[in-house]
Interface confidence: medium
């Protein structure tokens, strides 16, 4: 949702630097008055300063993505100017001592790297598609999700700094930028007002009709859903072995999508729900102001049935799920199993380098199509992830295990745990293939409650 | 189980202080950005404060600014938030969150302590 300002860390190094650079001798009290420095720059024309040594010489500035290396020896002679050093810039014309460095994008903030940094601009952050940015301080940004005005029409679209601004179907009244059904309106809230017609409607004139369907559309509805539970769990094993059975040679599956054009739907969304002071928030429901989507590609219910391992946390809302599947997500009482890894008191061990069953474990359990996501969230780069492919020809199982071998190496041996793994796959909404993971080491048996790996 | 528990909210007059104590359990604490977060009676929540993991970092909402300063004990599990110069539109429900590393979710919430500044 458009271009970034530098992030907030910067500030004082620019500060710092434009200090040092204007002013090389860095004793604060040989610093002219500002009056005086004024009179002294209006000296030179544009584009050039005045000789720290000197006041007589002119000497041209530097050109952005360049540094002063050295003042210029006499009038009409040349500024000795240096290219910055990779991880460094300049963006204007400057008689800097040094070029800055570059700054970084904060991924804890859901911040994407808009444009890399060069020479003579800064790297520009920003946040996904239909993301708006909270800000913290004028330069410190953070990204959420845009509302989708579900049960609503969007009033004002998503800016770049400002989320949607939704109004309400009738029936619905607006609690944290998401349309709630007047039924959940309690009589101490504001809604009162709002759903106030709606209320006295149900109460006065209940159509009987309604009374006696309703019950029974709920009950078709929860029988359709239970079989079509027990039809997915049964043809997940069938689809997995189909999936992985892509023998090397044969065809790969098809490119992920981009970055910025795809947003990923949550497995079990949960209509998000803000408490009323007295309210305890269970896992379920919990107050969210925003959320954010974490994936690079789209995703299909088939990635990674997750049936097995709902999310303890709160889902991203606004995401328009059936409620009667977000309730038994959500109160499920099945812990995931990264939940037990992190609860647990064991340090997590690391991983046997040794035993390729590992690392194949977790090639057989990713989904093809999140699978670049993934390693990229590991740390490779794009670089490395299409040399690797090119190296493997069209063996793509090969392709990846080399993937994970590379993380694995270049990462300290305490830190390359299955834990790590987890949070990853954590953040991209797979924990069904977590325990998938888990369940091919260790067996169909009882999860362990420690987050060992290898027996 | 991941658990955050407010404490030391109350009746306070306008002008007085407060501190806030979030203790945390159940995941690495020192590893996540820490947030505090409020909700006003009938009215949206509202982002108070933010404090990195190494507690080097401090952000607040403009409407708190210079009262409010957030701080952390990692040895101790703890998330405070020590409020002066209360005033009465402070009052809310105050929640400590926490969140995952990647995104900006919040994936855990305390369930909340009740700050009310009258006189």
């Known amino acids: 949702m458009g271009l970034s300002t530098v992030p907030d860390l910067l500030l004082p190094l620019v500060l710092l630097e434009l200090l040092v650079g204007i002013y090389p001798s860095g004793v604060i009290g040989l610093v002219p008055h500002l009056g005086d420095r004024e009179k002294r720059d209006s000296v030179c024309p544009q584009g050039k300063y005045i000789h720290p040594q000197n006041n007589s010489i002119c000497c041209t500035k530097c050109h952005k993505g360049t540094y002063l290396y050295n003042d210029c020896p006499g009038p009409g002679q040349d500024t000795d100017c240096r290219e910055c050093e990779s991880g460094s810039f300049t963006a204007s014309e400057n008689h800097l001592r040094h070029c800055l460095s570059c700054s970084k994008c904060r991924k804890e903030m859901g911040q994407v790297e808009i444009s890399s940094c060069t020479v003579d601009r800064d790297t520009v952050c920003g946040c996904r598609k239909n993301q708006y940015r909270h800000y913290w301080s004028e330069n410190l940004f953070q990204c959420f999700n845009c509302s989708l005005c579900l049960n609503g029409t969007v009033h004002l679209s998503c800016q770049e700094k400002q989320n949607t601004v939704c109004t309400c179907h009738a029936g619905f009244f607006l609690r944290e930028n998401e349309c709630v059904s007047c039924s959940n309106c309690k009589k101490s809230l504001e809604c009162t007002k709002l759903c106030l017609p709606q209320i006295e409607n149900v109460k006065g004139t209940e159509d009987s009709g309604t009374t006696v369907l309703l019950p029974l559309v709920i009950f078709f509805g929860l029988c359709l859903l239970s079989l079509l539970f027990i039809g997915l769990m049964y043809r997940y094993q069938r689809w997995k072995s189909k999936l992985y059975s892509i023998v090397c040679g044969k065809s790969t599956p098809e490119k992920e999508g981009e970055l910025e054009g795809t947003t990923t739907k949550p497995l079990a969304p949960n209509p998000s729900f803000s408490p009323t002071p007295g309210f305890t928030p269970t896992l379920g429901f919990s107050p969210v102001p925003s959320s954010t989507f974490t994936s690079s590609s789209t995703y299909t219910p088939g990635d990674c049935p997750n049936f097995a391992a709902p999310r303890r946390e709160v889902a991203p809302p606004y995401q328009g799920a059936d409620p009667i599947l977000a309730t038994a997500l959500a109160s499920d009482p099945i812990p995931n199993p990264l939940q037990k890894w992190e609860d647990s008191a064991h340090k997590p061990q690391s991983l046997d380098t040794d035993d390729p069953a590992t690392l194949y474990a977790v090639v057989e359990n990713v989904p093809p199509l999140r699978w670049k996501e993934f390693v990229r969230r590991l740390g490779l780069s794009d670089h490395e992830i299409d040399r690797l492919e090119l190296q493997n020809g069209r063996c793509l199982r090969e392709a990846q295990y080399s993937m994970l071998a590379t993380w694995r190496r270049r990462t300290p041996r305490r830190e390359a745990t299955l834990e790590l793994l987890g949070r990853v796959l954590r953040d991209m909404d797979l924990l069904g293939c977590l325990e998938d993971i888990e369940e091919a080491l260790c067996g169909p048996a009882a999860l362990p409650p420690a987050p060992s790996l290898l027996r | 189980e991941v658990q955050l528990l407010e404490s030391g909210g109350g009746l306070v007059q306008p002008g007085g202080s407060l501190r806030l104590s979030c203790a945390a359990s159940?995941?690495?604490?020192?590893?996540?950005?820490m947030y505090w977060v409020r909700q006003a009676p009938g009215k949206g929540l509202e982002w108070v404060s933010f404090?990195?993991?190494?507690?080097?970092?401090?952000y607040y909402a403009d409407s708190v600014k210079g009262r409010f300063t957030i701080s952390r004990d990692n040895s101790k599990n703890t998330l405070y938030l020590q409020m002066n110069s209360l005033r009465a539109e402070d009052t809310a429900v105050y929640y400590c969150a926490k969140t995952l590393s990647a995104d900006g979710r919040f994936d855990y919430w305390g369930q909340g302590t009740l700050v009310t500044v009258s006189s």
């Open positions: 404090i990195s993991p190494s507690g080097r970092e401090t």
């Open positions: 159940g995941f690495t604490f020192i590893g996540y950005n």
